[in-house]
Structures are given as structure tokens and as C-alpha cells.
């Protein structure tokens, strides 16, 4: 028998520094977690103690904090190189700055192989990107070799900016021939490493002949055997065992997100490459694990540029940006409109001639808007200003919901109207009319939504049975502010870009902004 230790991360999303327990900015260092300096300590400890160790990343290192905004992926290559990752799969967020924003900072600088079998380059890009990412890699480990095949969510064109010269194929269809090649090479221990979410991870384990282990990402899935060490609730045991169509037991793992845990899986193979046993658990990277001093020093050196950036002007406003709770929790506020417009703008993807865009709607809990921005400071807007408006380090995500769920959400928005509660929704691509004289749960008297399958966008009545795409804060997607119906009834959820980054990019693009209150939210006569 031969034993392999797989250490894995996924969806780190730019958390290079340690964070608080909820993966936001670290406030009390004695209670902070994660970060590359702490990760390195644990990885090195395991490498010293165990003979055959692989350190793998399942994608979405990009996007999530000011680190990515400023360094644009150079920080990912630098610190992953320092940690000596063995391989990485491409995630959807690796394409957030376009293909060039992937090639230059990461693909050309990473000292480890970057993988995806289901992304095929065409046209002029094919020669430019050739060899910079690979479908598979054969990694020598001790006296054996391990094959690693990569995969990436085929939804990436809807979630990011890969351009028109990359084709995202079906994961299973693309993986099988690459696994077959590895078998031909007499590589009999094969890991599928990728970024398509837990459901697809399980399908790959079931359907792709020859895959021994699946290491996934994208869905931020937390698996654990035994009593979990922090706040995350396990979606299943670690590893999650799938019985493949050819009768093998295939372990599937994921390690939550944000570098809070280091996935730790021990696999025992027989001489023919069959998995005899698999066990492990994610390791919580809490303050009991010291930060490596040399990596920490390097982090501090790279930090300097971030502090300078946050006070630089992104653009100007010539109007007061009303982000006060007195406005945003009671009525349409222009800060809410600005943020929603930025959210839609960030999701412009012309992927189909029939649609002007794949998504037109935004909802945003008023309680998530934490500050106004005064235009009387020469109109200057900085990252620091935006961090006061959106201090929680959330993301603006893409969900699919039925019209009936949206209707419930808007009823919830005003079910206890007047108490300055955070669930009052700001909107984009939606016209809503409330009648507060009616009883809670029946106050939405008009709900029109902007069409997507149209060449000239116009507002049409919401259809209860239709499925709509909506951009919203991850806080709402997870049922926050009492929006349980969104969490329970959503048909699909893909995590998006960092909230501040979305708004800052929009302001930089527009240069001068002047959002108005324009009748997106109305109250019928006599009720307000």
C-alpha cells in the first residue's frame, strides 16, 4: 500500500492576510484565522511529518479583498509560489479581469501547473495561451506518480469575463478522454481537481471512469466528520463518499472557503492504484497555529501599497450619495440605486443574440448600506469611503429564483415597515409599488421587472412561475435579514465579486456619477 496526503484549499478569494472568524477583516488578532502565513506553517509541519504530500488549490484565488483590486493576481502567484503549491485548477473568478488578467499575472508567473481540461482556446488566443494551462498533469510524488485533471465551471461565461475565444465544455465529457490518456500512460492514481461546485464534484466522482479522488470548489462546501471546530455547519462527512457507476468508492472533498481551513485527506492506494481507504478532516487555521515569520514579513511588505491605494480618488460624485439609514431603510435612496446599477454593470455578458444581457435585476437590503458619501469634499470618492458604505466584505452574487420567490421577498421587504429595519429592499431593473394600508404579506400591489430577452429593455409584470436571474448580496442569498425564502427556494447560486470592488470599478469607469431617486420604489397614494 502507498499513502498520499492531499492538502487542499479552494475559494480563498484574496484572503492573504488573516481574517476574523467570519472571514472579514481581522480586528482582534488573537482570535483571527487563516491567511497565507498561518497556512504555510501548517503545510510545512505536515510536509516535514509525512512522506507523500500534495498541496492543491481548486480555484477562485482571485477576487475578494483590496489585495486583488490592487495587485490583480500578482499577489496570488507570488504567495502560492512561496507556499510551493503543486497544482491549481482554474476557477471562474480567475477570469474576472479578462484572459489577459489571467495570463500575465498568474499563468506566466506561477511556478506550479494550472489546470483545466474543459476550457478550450480558439482563434488567436489558442497560440497565445498554449501551454500556459494544461488539461492534466502527472506529478511525481515519492516513487510514484499521481495524475491530476483539472476542470472549471462551464457557467464561467455568465459569471466572469473569459471573452469569446475560450470555450467551456461539459466537465464530464471533457474529463473522460484526459483520464483515459493518463491510464494509457500507466498513471493509476488520479485526482480530479476543479471548480464547478459540490453537485458537479459528486457527478464527476460517479461518472468519470478512472478518477480516484475529487477535490472541488466553487460551492464553498464545508464537510466534516465529528464535531465541527467553528461556526460552519457540515454539508456532509469528510470525505464525502460517492459510489461510482463502476462500483468504486470515490472520496469527494472541499474545504469551505477564504483560507479558513486547510483540507487534509489521507488516501491509501493498493499497488494497482485502487483506493483502499480515505480519511481526514479540514484543519481549522486558528490562532493556535502561529503565522510563519518570513511569509508574514513579506505580507507586511506587500501591504504598504494597499494602504496608499485606499486614499486615492476612484472618481467623483456631483450629488450627495444618500446612504443614510433614514433613507435606505424607508424609501428608494440614490446610494442604493448607485450600488444596484454597479451590480448590473458588473454582470454585463453578451453571450446570446436573443438577450441584451443575461440578468437585469438587482435587490439589495437597505441595512447593508452603512454610510452616505458627501459630495462637498470636492466630490472625491475613495476606496476608504466605499469601505464605510460596504464594510462587511461581502460579495454580489448571481442567483436564479422563481417569480413567486421574488414576490415573497418584496412582501418581506415591507412586512414590518417603519421600524428602520434592514430588510427594506433597494432595487435595480425592478419597479415596485407598495400599499402599506394593506396587511403584511399582501402589500406589493405592482411588481414590474426589466426584460432580458429583448433588444429594447422594458418593464413587464413579474410572472410567478418564470425563473429569473437576480444579482444580490451573498448576505441575502444566505437568508440574511429574514429572507429565508431566498435561501430555501433559490434554484442556483453562484458567488460573485467583492462588493466594494464592484462599486469602485463602476465609479472608476463612469468617472463622474450623479445617481438620482427615480421612482423605482413607490408607495400607492394615501398609504405613505
Amino acid at each position: 500500500a502507498w499513502e498520499l496526503t492531499i492538502l487542499h484549499t479552494n475559494d480563498v478569494h484574496s484572503r492573504l492576510e488573516q481574517t476574523s472568524e467570519d472571514s472579514s477583516k481581522c480586528v482582534n488578532a488573537s482570535r483571527c484565522m487563516g491567511g497565507v502565513a498561518r497556512l504555510f506553517t501548517k503545510v510545512q509541519q505536515i510536509r516535514r511529518a509525512e512522506p507523500n504530500v500534495l498541496l492543491l488549490d481548486a480555484g477562485d484565488q482571485y477576487q475578494g479583498t483590496i489585495w486583488f483590486t490592487v495587485y490583480k493576481g500578482a499577489e496570488v502567484a507570488h504567495f502560492m509560489n512561496a507556499l510551493r503549491y503543486d497544482a491549481m485548477a482554474l476557477g471562474n473568478h480567475e477570469f474576472d479581469n479578462g484572459v489577459e488578467g489571467l495570463i500575465e499575472p498568474l499563468l506566466k508567473e506561477a511556478k506550479f501547473p494550472i489546470l483545466s481540461a474543459n476550457i478550450k482556446a480558439k482563434g488567436p488566443l489558442a497560440s497565445q495561451i498554449s501551454g500556459l494551462y494544461l488539461p492534466y498533469k502527472v506529478l511525481p510524488v515519492g516513487d510514484e506518480v499521481v495524475g491530476i485533471v483539472g476542470y472549471t465551471s462551464k457557467e464561467t461565461p455568465f459569471l466572469s469575463n473569459p471573452g469569446t475565444n475560450l470555450v467551456f465544455e461539459d466537465e464530464i465529457t471533457a474529463l473522460q478522454p484526459e483520464v483515459d490518456k493518463l491510464k494509457t500512460l500507466n498513471v493509476n492514481k488520479i485526482i480530479a481537481l476543479g471548480h464547478s461546485g459540490f453537485e458537479m464534484d459528486k457527478l464527476i466522482a460517479q461518472k468519470v471512469r478512472g478518477v480516484d479522488v475529487v477535490v472541488g470548489g466553487h460551492s464553498n462546501t464545508f464537510l466534516y466528520t465529528g464535531n465541527p471546530p467553528s461556526k460552519e455547519v457540515p454539508a456532509g462527512k469528510y470525505p464525502f463518499i460517492v459510489t461510482s457507476d463502476d462500483g468504486r468508492k470515490v472520496p469527494v472533498v472541499q474545504a469551505y472557503a477564504f483560507g479558513k481551513y486547510l483540507g487534509y485527506l489521507k488516501i491509501e492506494f493498493d499497488e494497482r492504484g485502487n483506493v483502499i481507504s480515505s480519511h481526514g478532516n479540514p484543519i481549522l487555521l486558528n490562532s493556535s497555529i502561529p503565522e510563519d515569520p518570513s511569509i508574514k514579513a513579506d505580507i507586511n511588505k506587500w501591504r504598504i501599497k494597499l494602504d496608499n491605494y485606499s486614499t486615492q480618488e476612484l472618481g467623483k460624485t456631483i450629488v450627495y450619495l444618500d446612504g443614510s439609514s433614514q433613507s435606505c431603510r424607508f424609501r428608494e435612496c440614490n446610494m442604493g440605486n448607485l450600488i444596484c446599477d454597479a451590480m448590473i454593470n458588473n454582470n454585463l455578458r453578451h453571450t446570446d443574440e436573443m438577450f441584451w444581457n443575461h440578468v437585469s435585476m438587482c435587490i439589495l437590503n437597505g441595512g447593508g448600506i452603512r454610510s452616505p458619501i458627501d459630495e462637498r469634499n470636492n466630490g472625491t470618492i475613495t476606496w476608504e469611503n466605499l469601505a464605510a458604505v460596504l464594510p462587511f466584505g461581502g460579495t454580489f452574487d448571481l442567483v436564479q429564483l422563481k417569480g413567486s420567490t421574488l414576490k415573497k421577498a418584496f412582501e418581506h421587504s415591507v412586512h414590518r415597515y417603519g421600524q428602520s429595519t434592514g430588510e427594506f429592499l433597494q432595487v435595480g431593473g425592478i419597479h415596485v409599488v407598495y400599499d402599506l394600508s394593506r396587511k403584511p404579506g399582501d402589500r406589493v400591489v405592482k411588481l414590474d421587472v426589466l426584460c432580458t430577452k429583448c433588444r429594447v429593455p422594458s418593464y413587464d409584470p413579474l410572472k410567478m412561475d418564470e425563473v429569473y436571474k437576480v444579482i444580490l448580496p451573498n448576505f441575502l442569498a444566505n437568508g440574511g435579514d429574514g429572507f429565508q425564502m431566498i435561501k430555501d427556494e433559490l434554484l442556483r447560486h453562484d458567488s460573485g465579486d467583492q462588493d466594494i470592488n464592484v462599486v469602485s470599478t463602476y465609479i472608476s469607469k463612469m468617472k463622474v456619477i450623479y445617481p438620482a431617486v427615480e421612482g423605482r420604489i413607490k408607495f400607492s397614494t394615501g398609504s405613505h
Partner: antibody, heavy 119, light 107 residues
Framework: QVQLVQSGAEVKKPGASVKVSCKTS????????IYWVRQAPGQGLEWIGW????????KYNEKFKGRATLTADTSASTAYMELSSLRSEDTAVYYC????????????WGQGTLVTVSS | DIQLTQSPSFLSASVGDRVTITCKAS??????VAWYQQKPGQSPKLLIY???TRHTGVPDRFSGSGSGTEFTLTISSLQPEDFATYYC?????????FGQGTKVEIK
């Protein structure tokens, strides 16, 4: 573009050792295997072994085990092949090469280094 | 070790001819076969890998086929620059081995 440039020709006495270098450029050295192949005068090709600079693991043709040593210097993006206990039948052109996809054919080759073993 | 036997060892042909070189493996290697072209005083050049995949920049007159133990390299219309020695190689089992070569000469 990918380039592999080898050190110059060597003349060695039987029993001696030779170390051939292969300096790479145009790609990330640690991400690809370096393979070594030799070709005796007027003869065919013979695989010696490979090294993976990402973690310095090596694999040798049993015929060369114990005599060939493959190493790599990642800071210089250079691979080395040392052959010891040289005999006259080791006279050959020694090539380093790189693939496109692991193992699947040697796509890029050095210009070759002629090693002559003669007393 | 897996032996690869190429045939013919020598081949005389004219420009424009269709040329076929075969490579027989002593045991099955699936499709883990590459073909190379080598001219005197030069390094070998990869033509085909995975038995039938043409390497970037290789003219489409070169094609490969076969799986298991029998493989073929075909040059559909021989050009003056194609006169060289051709080698097959298997990378399915260690030690990786090459055929003895087929020298294509001008008739």
C-alpha cells in the same frame, strides 16, 4: 519562445564523468519535465530519464541507474545530466528535451552535446 | 522492455509520393506513441503525439494512426524537405523506447 540551450562538446577518458547542462528559457521551468535522450553515432535514440524541476523527482532508465544523475537549478532554469564511469560506448550526442503535455512526446529539444569517450 | 520495430528501415521515394511507415510494438501501448523527424546534424523534431495528434506547426500532409501494437505515419505527398529519418517512440511503459528509424531517401 521555448528554447533549450546545451553546453558544448566534451572529450572524456574512460572511467571519468561528464556533466552536460541544459539552460531553458521562454517558459516556466518548474512546470515541465526535462527529459534526456542520447544518440550514438549513426544509431537510434535512447531515453535516459527525466527530472521534474517542480519537486526534483527523477526517473531513470534502468540501464543508466547508478551512472546517470539528473539535477536541476530552478534559480538558473537549468537542468543537468551527469554520467559517470564513462566507457567508449557512451560516445554519443546527448539531448535534453521538453514536452507539451506530460510524457506525450518531446516537443522541444536542445541542440545536443557531443560527448566523446576516448583514451 | 517494449521493442518497437519500424518498417521499412530504408525507403526510396519521389517528391509527390504517398509514403507510409509502420511501427510495431512488442506489446500493447494503447495510443501512447509519438513520431519524430530527424535530419543529419539536427535534433529530432516532434511530428505526432498520442498516435494521431499533430504537433503545432507540423504540415497537415503528416498524419498518424493506429492503437495497441500497430502504428502508421503517413506523408500524403512527399516534399523535398521531408527527406530525413523518422522514429516512432512509445511512452506507455518504462523504459520509454524508440524504433530503430526509417530513412526516407530521394529515388
Amino acid at each position: 519562445q521555448v528554447q533549450l540551450v546545451q553546453s558544448g562538446a566534451e572529450v572524456k577518458k574512460p572511467g571519468a564523468s561528464v556533466k552536460v547542462s541544459c539552460k531553458t528559457s521562454g517558459y516556466t521551468f518548474t512546470r515541465y519535465y526535462i527529459y534526456w535522450v542520447r544518440q550514438a553515432p549513426g544509431q537510434g535514440l535512447e531515453w535516459i530519464g527525466w527530472i521534474y524541476p517542480g519537486n526534483f523527482n527523477t526517473k531513470y532508465n534502468e540501464k543508466f541507474k547508478g551512472r546517470a544523475t539528473l539535477t536541476a537549478d530552478t534559480s538558473a532554469s537549468t537542468a543537468y545530466m551527469e554520467l559517470s564511469s564513462l566507457r567508449s560506448e557512451d560516445t554519443a550526442v546527448y539531448y535534453c528535451a521538453r514536452d507539451v503535455y506530460d510524457y506525450a512526446g518531446f516537443a522541444y529539444w536542445g541542440q545536443g552535446t557531443l560527448v566523446t569517450v576516448s583514451s | 522492455d517494449i521493442q518497437l520495430t519500424q518498417s521499412p528501415s530504408f525507403l526510396s521515394a519521389s517528391v509527390g509520393d504517398r509514403v507510409t511507415i509502420t511501427c510495431k510494438a512488442s506489446q500493447g501501448v494503447a495510443t501512447a506513441v509519438a513520431w519524430y523527424q530527424q535530419k543529419p546534424g539536427q535534433s529530432p523534431k516532434l511530428l505526432i503525439y498520442w498516435a494521431s495528434t499533430r504537433h503545432t506547426g507540423v504540415p497537415d500532409r503528416f498524419s498518424g494512426s493506429g492503437s495497441g501494437t500497430e502504428f502508421t505515419l503517413t506523408i500524403s505527398s512527399l516534399q523535398p524537405e521531408d527527406f530525413a529519418t523518422y522514429y516512432c517512440q512509445q511512452y506507455s511503459s518504462y523504459p520509454w523506447t524508440f524504433g530503430q528509424g526509417t530513412k526516407v531517401e530521394i529515388k
